[in-house]
Interface confidence: low
């Protein structure tokens, strides 16, 4: 099942949206998220702890939208119209992996299983919502 399927029931029973509190994920084009996120973290604090591991990579700048992509999984966009978190689309993931995985290897990192691009929707459509690369994130 792809992440981000549209729910006509408008999120009945889903956790409410909450303000993005993770410093790395502020000012990226949306400001509401929902927990648990797409990686199973139940709180933003828990998500932030893992996300911080990528800080050197974001600073390195291997991919212009890496921060946006990571935040789309760790603090995915939330809207009251959709019951599930909305991740980035697969092409953004694949570009980030292509450019950043070789750099990660230099830092003794492997590209994490949790960032498996195959789990993400191929493109944004009403049946599998996802976010395209932003203009200026």
């Amino acid at each position: 099942l792809e992440i981000g399927r549209f729910d006509p029931e408008r999120g009945r029973g889903a956790a409410p949206c909450q303000a993005v509190e993770i410093p790395m994920c502020r000012g990226i084009g949306y400001n509401l998220t929902r927990m648990p996120n797409l990686l199973g973290h139940t709180s933003q604090g828990e998500a932030a702890a893992e996300l911080a591991e990528f800080a050197p990579l974001v600073q390195y700048g291997c991919h212009s939208h890496l921060r946006f992509f990571l935040c789309s999984l760790y603090a995915p966009m939330c809207t009251d119209q959709v019951s599930t978190p909305i991740p980035a689309c697969r092409p953004m993931c694949e570009q980030a992996r292509l450019r950043c995985a070789p750099i990660m290897e230099q830092f003794n990192f492997g590209w994490p299983d949790s960032l498996d691009c195959a789990r993400l929707p191929t493109r944004n459509d009403p049946h599998a919502l996802c976010m395209e690369a932003p203009e200026n994130a």
Epitope: G45, A48, A49, E50, A52, E53, A55, P56, Q59, E105, F107, N108, F109, G110, P112, D113
Partner: antibody, heavy 118, light 107 residues
Framework: QVQLVQSGAEVKKPGSSVKVSCKAS????????ISWVRQAPGQGLEWVGR????????NYAQKFQGRVTITADESTSTAYMELSSLRSEDTAVYYC???????????WGQGTLVTVSS | EIVLTQSPATLSVSPGERATLSCRAS??????LAWYQQKPGQAPRLLIY???TRATGIPARFSGSGSGTEFTLTISSLQSEDFAVYYC?????????FGQGTKVEIK
């Protein structure tokens, strides 16, 4: 390349606490992940927990939850591991190491022997 | 938690011979597995990360392979300084876990 230097050996009484330090030099400390791993005499390696200094957020192995506190001082690039309610089975060499989530451990500190004995 | 089982517990090998060490995970760890060497009285030293990538300064006689649940560390021609204990470790999920170790001793 980061280098990690640990504090010296400690002898403690059962029920007391110990605080071991790990000073980093030669690389980014704040955005690193610093883990603590222990090794009882003649035994294997056991992960205790880790901290990301820039966040101050620590994760602990379930076994040590409630007894261990890992902290970091960014101003001195030093990580600390405090273990309380010590018992004889806590006698071990405690290592700090860089890494600990999606990352292997490298480098390692030289180790600190903590002996718990009455 | 993910359990890593190393085999054999002890491996007796003559210098110059090939040594093959195994590490099996109770569930998939992808390629997020490392190998360490530890000599008496010393801290562990990273040999292999990402299941197959040699760490900086590690001789080419050390190689790692595998993914998922089955991993192998191979030392192609044992030197005297290679006799030590070897540990595998997964960094795919919490809690981080180590294998129990394989001791490589002189035959």
């Amino acid at each position: 390349q980061v280098q990690l230097v640990q504090s010296g050996a400690e002898v403690k009484k059962p029920g007391s606490s110990v605080k071991v330090s790990c000073k980093a030099s030669g690389g980014a400390f704040s955005t690193s992940s610093i883990s603590w791993v222990r090794q009882a005499p003649g035994q294997g390696l056991e992960w205790v927990g880790r901290i990301i200094p820039v966040l101050g957020t620590a994760n602990y192995a379930q076994k040590f939850q409630g007894r261990v506190t890992i902290t970091a001082d960014e101003s001195t690039s030093t990580a600390y591991m405090e273990l309380s309610s010590l018992r004889s089975e806590d006698t071990a060499v405690y290592y700090c190491a860089k890494g600990g989530w999606r990352s292997s451990f490298d480098p390692w500190g030289q180790g600190t022997l903590v002996t718990v004995s009455s | 938690e993910i359990v890593l089982t190393q085999s054999p517990a002890t491996l007796s090998v003559s210098p110059g011979e090939r040594a093959t060490l195994s590490c099996r995970a109770s569930q998939s760890v992808s390629s997020n597995l490392a190998w360490y060497q530890q000599k008496p009285g010393q801290a562990p030293r990273l040999l292999i990360y990402g299941a197959s990538t040699r760490a900086t300064g590690i001789p080419a006689r050390f190689s790692g392979s595998g993914s998922g649940t089955e991993f192998t560390l191979t030392i192609s021609s044992l030197q005297s300084e290679d006799f030590a204990v070897y540990y595998c470790q997964q960094y795919n999920s919490w809690p981080l876990t180590f294998g129990q170790g394989t001791k490589v001793e002189i035959k």
